[in-house]
């Protein structure tokens, strides 16, 4: 149903009336594009720490994975981890950072000319939800070694960054993930790796570019927990 | 900076029909998409259909399916949503927000819709 699709895609920490009933299974809980929520065109930030529960790796951030946060824990309570930096060991490419894949069990670089031909995966929206197609042609669309011959540009549908042209991340929009620009210096940014912002948001934002991080706005100090301003700046 | 201006709300009867509009200005970059949502006192915000330029799809919530459509035009930046067969429950403040290609994202301010029994 769409309530058990959009309980991942909800505002999860939020004071209620937003955020109430998130983050169980079942319950009613909708969708909003990420953290972001109306109030003169601001995108707000919140900088609550808390682990955010996931099934598959597609539930967490671009730069997060999904698994079990103890060595050989319960198979059952799995949460989105940060993703693993180049030379650390890996089992899956979900696990390492974006721009990186699994090779031998290390997180290589995926700009050594890598090329991922051997995938062959089937998006299949199965959704609760109407995905309708503008033109009323199948909804079904399978991303065959074919595609990956020249990397996705700005609007390709893509599995994983390492689909799109450099300069572009693979983010979520809707119910699909597309190649979008990765951010620049200044721009407003998502702070991962906290519940609520963890990459499900309906309209995903890249990360920040090489040499940056996403951090709060200096002048967005003194502002409450609740608007707090990341934007991608210089290490 | 991107504006998104909600227009069409109003009080009407349960049965009734209602037709919202959002016009974006101020862009210039394109837009992937267009999406309503919807917020009730006491409730979440929900969201409640969508439209992708970019994938060519519209995508609609379980609770609305079949009563109401979006539609749009991507060159005038506008996104309607057509309404039909209210609700008592459709009854929230609608918001329209934008996934824009220069990496933000916006929001309009709202408009009211009610639904009597």
């Known amino acids: 149903t769409l309530n058990s699709v959009l309980n991942s895609n909800a505002i999860k920490n939020l004071p209620p009336p937003l955020g109430g009933a998130a983050g169980h299974p079942g319950s009613a809980v909708s969708a909003a594009p990420g953290i972001l929520y109306p109030g003169g065109n601001k995108y707000q930030t919140i900088d609550n720490y808390q682990p955010y529960p996931c099934a598959e790796d597609e539930e967490c951030g671009t730069d997060e994975y999904c698994a079990s946060p103890t060595r050989g824990g319960d198979a059952g309570v799995q949460i989105c981890l940060a993703c693993r930096k180049r030379r650390k060991r890996c089992m899956r490419h979900a696990m390492c950072c974006p721009g990186n894949y699994c090779k031998n069990g290390i997180c290589v670089s995926s700009d050594q000319n890598h090329f991922r031909g051997e995938i062959e995966e089937t998006i299949t929206e199965s959704f609760g939800n109407d995905h309708s197609t503008l033109d009323g042609y199948s909804r079904r669309t399978t991303l065959s070694s074919k595609m990956y011959h020249t990397k996705g540009q700005e609007g390709s549908v893509c599995l994983r960054s390492s689909d799109c042209a450099s300069g572009l991340c693979c983010a979520r929009h809707f119910w699909s993930k597309i190649c979008k620009p990765v951010l620049k210096e200044g721009q407003v940014c998502t702070k991962h790796r906290r519940k609520g912002s963890h990459g499900l948001e309906i309209f995903q934002r890249c990360y920040c570019g090489e040499g940056l991080s996403c951090r709060i706005q200096k002048d967005h100090h003194q502002a409450s927990n609740s608007s707090r301003l990341h934007t991608c700046q210089r290490h | 900076e991107v504006q998104l201006v909600e227009s069409g709300g109003g009080l009407v009867q349960a049965g009734g029909s209602l037709r919202l509009s959002c016009a974006a200005s101020?862009?210039?970059?394109?837009?992937?998409?267009m999406g309503w949502f919807r917020h009730a006192p006491g409730k979440e915000r929900e969201f409640v259909a969508g439209?992708?330029?970019?994938?060519?799809?519209?995508y609609y919530a379980d609770s609305v399916k079949g009563r109401f459509t979006i539609s749009g035009d991507n060159a005038k930046n506008t996104v309607y949503l057509q309404m039909n067969s209210l609700k008592p429950e459709d009854t929230a403040v609608y918001y329209c927000a934008s996934d824009e290609s220069d990496a933000a994202n916006y929001w309009g301010q709202g408009t009211q819709v009610t639904v009597s029994s």
């Open positions: 101020g862009r210039t970059f394109s837009s992937y998409g």
């Open positions: 439209i992708s330029w970019t994938l060519g799809r519209t």
